[in-house]
Interface confidence: low
């Protein structure tokens, strides 16, 4: 891979746990300013695999509140507005990074943690197992 | 709100930027060990709003590789396997936290950054604007 020269203005890395322990500025930079603000506000309701959003709160985590999608139906909504059980509503899941306070209750010490969240639902054709 | 007592074993917070700058252990704890590894591996293909996954790589970001979903069609796949343009395939987007090297190329100094990623696609009923 490409070796990027180290910036001479980098903070000191004398910490015995380096490079596992790093300094992180929590002043979040948001790269989403130019995105379309209408992007997905009501998809949860208009989808053929609609979902509800549930609040998951944990003060020992950063961010402390995450919203989890739960599919409303096992099947998908058809053109008549009825649930079609020949199709399946399934959650689209993604692994995200969060910060976990470690040791617990510490205001300035965290550990990176990967958690799996359901972001929304999609309608899929079921896998049918034919018995010989 | 509830005040959680500070753990006496917390690291020192004398840093002048505290509490904006915190210590983070990059030794990731993965809470997803019991999840089904097949959980959504083929939904991108079986969905009525199928998508392709594109690799987005940035060595100055942690994680450096993120996969972005792009819907294959404007419409959705109907029961006959054809694209139905009376429905819309739309990306389900989510904001995620990443770490951005700051100053650039520093191995041990990061800033939290929020980026918007498309995780998958869902099929929605279009919003029809009726003209009087």
């Amino acid at each position: 891979g490409i070796t990027i020269p180290r910036n001479p203005g980098c903070p000191n890395s004398e910490d015995k746990n380096f490079p596992r322990t790093v300094m992180v500025n929590l002043n979040i930079h948001n790269r989403n300013t130019n995105t379309n603000p209408k992007r997905s506000s009501d998809y949860y309701n208009r989808s053929t695999s609609p979902w509800n959003l549930h609040r998951n709160e944990d003060p020992e985590r950063y961010p402390s509140v995450i919203w989890e999608a739960k599919c409303r139906h096992l099947g998908c909504i058809n053109a008549d507005g009825n649930v079609d059980y020949h199709m399946n509503s399934v959650p689209i899941q993604q692994e995200i990074l969060v910060l976990r306070r470690e040791p617990p209750h510490c205001p300035n010490s965290f550990r990176l943690e990967k958690i799996l969240v359901s972001v929304g639902c999609t309608c899929v054709t079921p896998i049918v197992h034919h018995v010989a | 709100g509830i005040t959680i007592p500070r753990n006496p074993g917390c690291p020192n917070s004398e840093d002048k930027n505290f509490p904006r700058t915190v210590m983070v252990n990059l030794n990731i704890h993965n809470r997803n060990t019991n999840t089904n590894p097949k959980r959504s591996s083929d939904y991108y293909n079986r969905s009525t709003s199928p998508w392709n996954l594109h690799r987005n790589e940035d060595p100055e970001r942690y994680p450096s590789v993120i996969w972005e979903a792009k819907c294959r069609h404007l419409g959705c796949i109907n029961a006959d396997g054809n694209v139905d343009y009376h429905m819309n395939s739309v990306p389900i987007q989510q904001e995620i936290l990443v770490l951005r090297r700051e100053p650039p190329h520093c191995p041990n100094s990061f800033r939290l950054e929020k980026i918007l990623v498309s995780v998958g696609c869902t099929c929605v009923t279009p919003i029809v604007h009726h003209v009087a």
């Epitope: 979040i28 603000p37 209408k38 992007r39 997905s40 506000s41 959003l53 961010p63 402390s64 509140v65 995450i66 919203w67 969240v117 972001v119 929304g120 | 389900i92 987007q93 989510q94 904001e95 995620i96 936290l97 929020k114």
Partner: nanobody, 119 residues
């Protein structure tokens, strides 16, 4: 950091009224559409009402149309929800939310205010 603080919830009898307020700080309030969102006990999240940046357009979920009115005061960075003819099914925690973002991170949401409609 973005902060949204809701107030005005409480216990009210069916047919009664409440006015919810949301004090916003940490962002340019007048640049964002704002929502009132609710979560009934054991239920999913429901968008209740939305108001555009300048207050010119307002949207409501069918179940509250004609009973609830969303408004804003950009000079005071405040969002309001006037709730009239309250019903038992309006019982929920009400949150104000910034923008039309897929909700994930806490800085777009307040802690909520509980509205209980009961006789």
């Amino acid at each position: 950091q973005v902060q949204l603080v809701e107030s005005g919830g409480g216990l009210v009898q069916p047919g009664g009224s409440l006015r919810l307020s949301c004090a916003a700080s940490g962002f340019t309030f007048s640049s964002y559409g704002m929502y009132w969102v609710r979560q009934a006990p054991g239920k999913g999240l429901e968008w209740v009402a939305k108001i555009e940046q300048d207050g010119s357009e307002k949207y409501y979920v069918d179940s509250v149309k004609g009973r609830f009115t969303i408004s804003r005061d950009n000079a005071k960075n405040s969002l309001f929800l006037q709730m009239n003819s309250l019903r038992a099914e309006d019982t929920a925690v009400y949150y104000c939310a910034k923008g039309e973002i897929l909700p994930l991170y806490f800085d777009y949401w307040g802690q909520g205010t509980l509205v209980t409609v009961s006789s």
